[in-house]
Amino acid sequence: MGRARDAILDALENLSGDELKKFKMKLLTVQLREGYGRIPRGALLQMDAIDLTDKLVSYYLESYGLELTMTVLRDMGLQELAEQLQTTKEESGAVAAAASVPAQSTARTGHFVDQHRQALIARVTEVDGVLDALHGSVLTEGQYQAVRAETTSQDKMRKLFSFVPSWNLTCKDSLLQALKEIHPYLVMDLEQS
């Protein structure tokens, strides 16, 4: 996706000081999807627009972060700003859909990530590099920290795979891309096996 961060920042920077305060207050009470935590009040109230944007993306990922921002803006009566986010969401959706087309054949036979789960748990050593690549776009801040908290590479990979069932094709493609960059020979080996 990637566009969401810029879109959220533009929206938040286009709020007056009072509107940004109101946005934060509403963010503290807005109904969240199951499985998502709330940004701590103390930290939230101190944030400027750039910090808040990054926090929204790391806590809720780009797609839901964008949706949440839209919801709060609409609740504040700021339709115009919300509409612009809606446009970004639709554009990003089209891009994501287009990007996932080549992967349809792999979806039928099982994605690389699912097919090689055991081997990846056993053989990926540079887990932190993989996590950094997924941080904010696929993994929430909490998930990122949870994986990093594990001590061995295998445990980290097991923890990472515990989040995979809730991922879509784009998320799995992102993991595959990260693995290709960090462990190209491992990926090549597994693709040929």
Epitope: R3, R5, D6, D10, A11, E19, I50, D54, L81, E83
Partner: antibody, heavy 112, light 106 residues
């Protein structure tokens, strides 16, 4: 399609002021921020600052504070940058840009 | 402010060659943006949020990195890729650009 149309080339005297314009079309003017970027001949890009038209929030690189003033006129969907106390160092091409679209640039020449 | 240092400053590559341009930040940034500029024209938005290609950018381009280290890679150099490339951070005000990398074709 977002378009940014910048004003024409300017020739100014040292010590004078000049106001460059950037007319936006094809998107909701108040929903984007507009950045201004300087490029001297054969040199790299320098970020001057940014204005968010709806809120009026502005951010500047310290180097350009006191030199550049960014404003925006919502009814005409136009952003402006005023440069004051001009010197030869201000001779450059100035671009306006939104998230991912750029204007064609305005060439400013400061000469006596 | 965050200083971005690009390397190399100038380089030339043969058609078909792999090219990597790096951008190092003086402190950690969340994303990197890349622009392509050819002489006498406005910069073009090229890669956004570290690794996403802007509309119309050929698939031979890719972007990667995190923290303070980012890169733009061309898998197989083509004549039309000869240009100057700039990185930009939008994580902290003032936003800043790298000094640019001029890429020439051999």
């Amino acid at each position: 399609q977002v378009q940014l149309q910048q004003s024409g080339a300017e020739l100014a005297r040292p010590g004078a002021s000049v106001k460059l314009s950037c007319k936006a079309s094809g998107h909701t003017f108040t929903s984007y921020g507009i950045s201004w970027v300087k490029q001297r001949t054969g040199q790299g890009l320098e970020w001057i600052g940014k204005i968010y038209p709806r809120s009026g929030n502005t951010y500047y690189d310290e180097k350009f504070k006191g030199k550049a003033t960014l404003t925006a006129d919502k009814p005409s969907t136009t952003a402006y940058m005023e440069l004051r106390s001009l010197t030869s160092e201000d001779s450059a091409v100035y671009f306006c840009a939104t998230r991912d679209y750029w204007g064609q640039g305005t060439t400013l020449t400061v000469s006596s | 402010q965050i200083v971005l240092t690009q390397s190399p400053v100038i380089m030339s590559a043969s058609p078909g060659e792999k090219v990597t341009i790096t951008c190092s930040a003086s402190s950690s940034v969340s994303y990197m943006y890349w622009f392509q500029q050819k002489p006498g024209t406005s910069p073009k938005f090229w890669i956004y949020s570290t690794s996403n290609l802007a509309s119309g950018v050929p698939a031979r381009f890719s972007g990667s990195g995190s923290g303070t280290s980012y890169s733009l890679t061309i898998s197989r150099m083509e004549a039309e890729d000869a240009a100057t490339y700039y990185c930009q951070q939008r994580s902290r005000y003032p936003w800043t650009f790298g000094g640019g990398t001029k890429l020439e074709i051999k």
